[in-house]
Interface confidence: medium
C-alpha cells in the first residue's frame, strides 16, 4: 500500500507544493515536537503485576538508530505477595512507528520508509481458556 | 544525526550522517500490520488494568488513524471481577514518529514528527507511605 | 480533618519575588501529589503547576515557566511556591489543592482537598 | 484562551436538569479522565466528579458525569437554588504538558 494521496478538492495550493519525482516523496527529517513532555509515571516497568525489561536496540541504517523495546519478564503475573501467579498472563502491549532505512546499493544510497512493531510494556491479562467440547 | 558506515571503494562525497532531507520510496516496508488494536487483540477487555481505545484520525498525518488508550478505571480488576482500589491502573505511553503533511495538504511532502500516544494500561503497585 | 492553609500572599511591586507556603495536614503529605491554583479577580480557574508525591516531577503552566518554582518538604508537610519576576497579570487568589488518589496520580484524578486561597496583587 | 470549551452560561428552574458540555481535543480529554469543580462565590473550588463519571463521597448523586470521545458533560438533576454556582471541566494535557481548566460555565437557577 502506498501513502494515500489527499485529493485535489482538499488542496489550496497545489502549485506551492515542491516537485517530486514519480514513486517517491520528499522526508525533512528534523522532528516536529521533538521534546514530548510525558506525563507516565515513574518505574512502572517494575511495580507493573506484569513486570518488564527494556532492551535499546540499535542500528546504524536506520533513523531514528536507537529504538527501545520491552520485553515481559514473566509468563504469569504477580500477585500481591510478589509470587508468580500462573493462572494470569504477562503479554506485550505493542504500538507501530515509523523509521527511515537507509539502503547501499553498491556506491548509491537509498532511503525507505518502513513501520517497525514496538513493545512498549506489558500488561497482566485473564487468559483466554479453550475447553474440550 | 547518527553515523552510516560507507564501503570504502565509493567516493569520499557521502556524508556519513543522514541529511536532513530525503528522497525516500512511496512503498513502506512492513505496511501490513494490523493497525486497528481492536482488532488484533482483545488484551484491552482481557486486562486486569482495562482500556478503552478512543479514534485519533487527522488527514495531515500518516498514519492518518491513530488508536488512544484511555484507563477505565483508577483501580484494576481483582479475581472477583471489582475494582480494587488497592492497586491503580496506568497509562503506558510512548512516543512514535509519524509523517506530517509539510507544505499542508501536498500529496508528497512530508516531515517526521514525534507524538505521543497512549498505547494501553498495566496495573501497578501504588507508591504509598505508611505512618511510622 | 483534612487541612491546608495557604500563606505569604501579599502586595509586591512588578519584577520582585514572593514564597506562598500551604501547610497540610490531616493526610499523609508525602503521599499526594499536590497542585497550586490561581484566580485573578472575576476570571476563571487557572491552573500554575503540580508537583508528584516526592519531588521528582514538576509541571507548569506556560504563563509562569521559568518564574515560578514549586517545591515541597515532605518532613515539614509544606509545599512552596517560590515565585519571580512577578508582572501585573500574576495578581490573583492562589490556591493549593491535594491531589485525590496517592502515588501515581500527581498529574491528574480530580483535586479533592483546596486551601482557602491567599492573595497575591503585584502593582506598582 | 482554555483548550477546554465550556458553554459561558447555562440555566433551569428548580427540578429541571441542566448539562454542561466540555469540548476539548486527543491530547487532553480523549487521553485523560475528566474532573468537575463547582464554585460558590467567595468560596474555594469543590471537587464534583472526578475519573470522568466518579462522585466523592458527600456528592449527592444529581451530579453525574460522562465522557465520549474528546467531549464531557457534567448533568445537573432536580435543580436546586443552591446549584447556582460557577462549574469547570479540568484534565490533563499532553500537548501543554499540565493540568488545564476549562473557560467555566456559570449556572444560573432561575424563579
Known amino acids: 500500500r502506498k501513502i494515500p494521496k489527499v485529493g485535489h478538492t482538499f488542496f489550496q495550493k497545489p502549485e506551492s507544493c515542491p516537485p517530486v519525482p514519480g514513486g517517491s516523496m520528499k522526508l525533512d527529517i528534523g522532528i516536529i515536537n521533538e521534546n514530548q513532555r510525558v506525563s507516565m509515571s515513574r518505574n512502572i516497568e517494575s511495580r507493573s503485576t506484569s513486570p518488564w525489561n527494556y532492551t535499546v536496540t540499535w542500528d546504524p541504517n536506520r533513523y531514528p538508530s536507537e529504538v527501545v523495546q520491552a520485553q515481559c519478564r514473566n509468563l504469569g503475573c504477580i500477585n500481591a505477595q510478589g509470587k508468580e501467579d500462573i493462572s494470569m498472563n504477562s503479554v506485550p502491549i505493542q504500538q507501530e512507528t515509523l523509521v527511515v532505512r537507509r539502503k547501499h546499493q553498491g556506491c548509491s544510497v537509498s532511503f525507505q520508509l518502513e513501520k517497525v512493531l514496538v513493545t512498549v510494556g506489558c500488561t497482566c491479562v485473564t487468559p483466554v481458556i479453550h475447553h474440550v467440547q | 544525526g547518527i553515523t552510516i558506515p560507507r564501503n570504502p571503494g565509493c567516493p569520499n562525497s557521502e556524508d556519513k550522517n543522514f541529511p536532513r532531507t530525503v528522497m525516500v520510496n512511496l512503498n513502506i516496508h512492513n505496511r501490513n500490520t494490523n493497525t486497528n488494536p481492536k482488532r488484533s487483540s482483545d488484551y484491552y477487555n482481557r486486562s486486569t488494568s482495562p482500556w478503552n481505545l478512543h479514534r485519533n484520525e487527522d488527514p495531515e498525518r500518516y498514519p492518518s488513524v491513530i488508536w488512544e488508550a484511555k484507563c477505565r478505571h483508577l483501580g484494576c480488576i481483582n479475581a472477583d471481577g471489582n475494582v480494587d482500589y488497592h492497586m491503580n491502573s496506568v497509562p503506558i505511553q510512548q512516543e512514535i514518529l509519524v509523517l506530517r503533511r509539510e507544505p499542508p495538504h501536498c500529496p508528497n511532502s512530508f516531515r517526521l514528527e514525534k507524538i505521543l500516544v497512549s498505547v494501553g494500561c498495566t496495573c501497578v503497585t501504588p507508591i504509598v507511605h505508611h505512618v511510622a | 480533618e483534612v487541612q491546608l492553609l495557604e500563606s505569604g500572599g501579599g502586595v509586591v511591586q512588578p519584577g520582585r519575588s514572593l514564597r506562598l507556603s500551604c501547610a497540610a495536614s490531616g493526610f499523609i503529605f508525602r503521599n499526594y501529589g499536590m497542585h497550586w491554583v490561581r484566580q485573578a479577580p472575576g476570571k476563571g480557574l487557572e491552573w500554575v503547576a503540580v508537583?508528584?508525591?516526592?519531588?521528582?516531577?514538576?509541571y507548569y503552566a506556560d504563563s509562569v515557566k521559568g518564574r515560578f518554582t514549586i517545591s515541597r518538604d515532605n518532613s515539614k508537610n509544606t509545599l512552596y511556591l517560590e515565585m519571580n519576576s512577578l508582572r501585573p497579570e500574576d495578581t490573583a487568589v492562589y490556591y493549593c489543592?491535594?491531589?485525590?488518589?496517592?502515588?501515581?496520580?500527581?498529574?491528574?484524578?480530580?483535586?479533592?482537598?483546596w486551601g482557602q486561597g491567599t492573595t497575591v496583587t503585584v502593582s506598582s | 484562551q482554555s483548550v477546554l470549551t465550556q458553554p459561558p452560561s447555562a440555566s433551569g428552574t428548580p427540578g429541571q436538569t441542566v448539562s454542561i458540555s466540555c469540548s476539548g481535543s486527543n491530547s487532553n480529554i480523549g487521553r485523560h479522565p475528566v474532573d468537575w469543580y463547582q464554585q460558590v462565590p467567595g468560596a474555594a473550588p469543590k471537587l464534583l466528579i472526578y475519573?470522568?463519571?466518579q462522585r466523592p463521597s458527600g456528592v449527592p448523586d444529581r451530579f453525574s458525569g460522562s465522557q465520549s470521545g474528546t467531549s464531557a458533560s457534567l448533568a445537573i438533576s432536580g435543580l436546586q437554588s443552591e446549584d447556582e454556582a460557577d462549574y469547570y471541566c479540568?484534565?490533563?494535557?499532553?500537548?501543554?504538558?499540565?493540568?488545564?481548566f476549562g473557560s467555566g460555565t456559570k449556572v444560573t437557577v432561575l424563579g
Open positions: 479540568a484534565t490533563w494535557d499532553d500537548s501543554l504538558g499540565g493540568y488545564v
Open positions: 475519573y470522568d463519571d
Open positions: 508537583i508528584s508525591y516526592d519531588g521528582s516531577n514538576k
Open positions: 489543592a491535594k491531589v485525590g488518589a496517592s502515588g501515581d496520580y500527581y498529574y491528574s484524578y480530580g483535586l479533592d482537598v
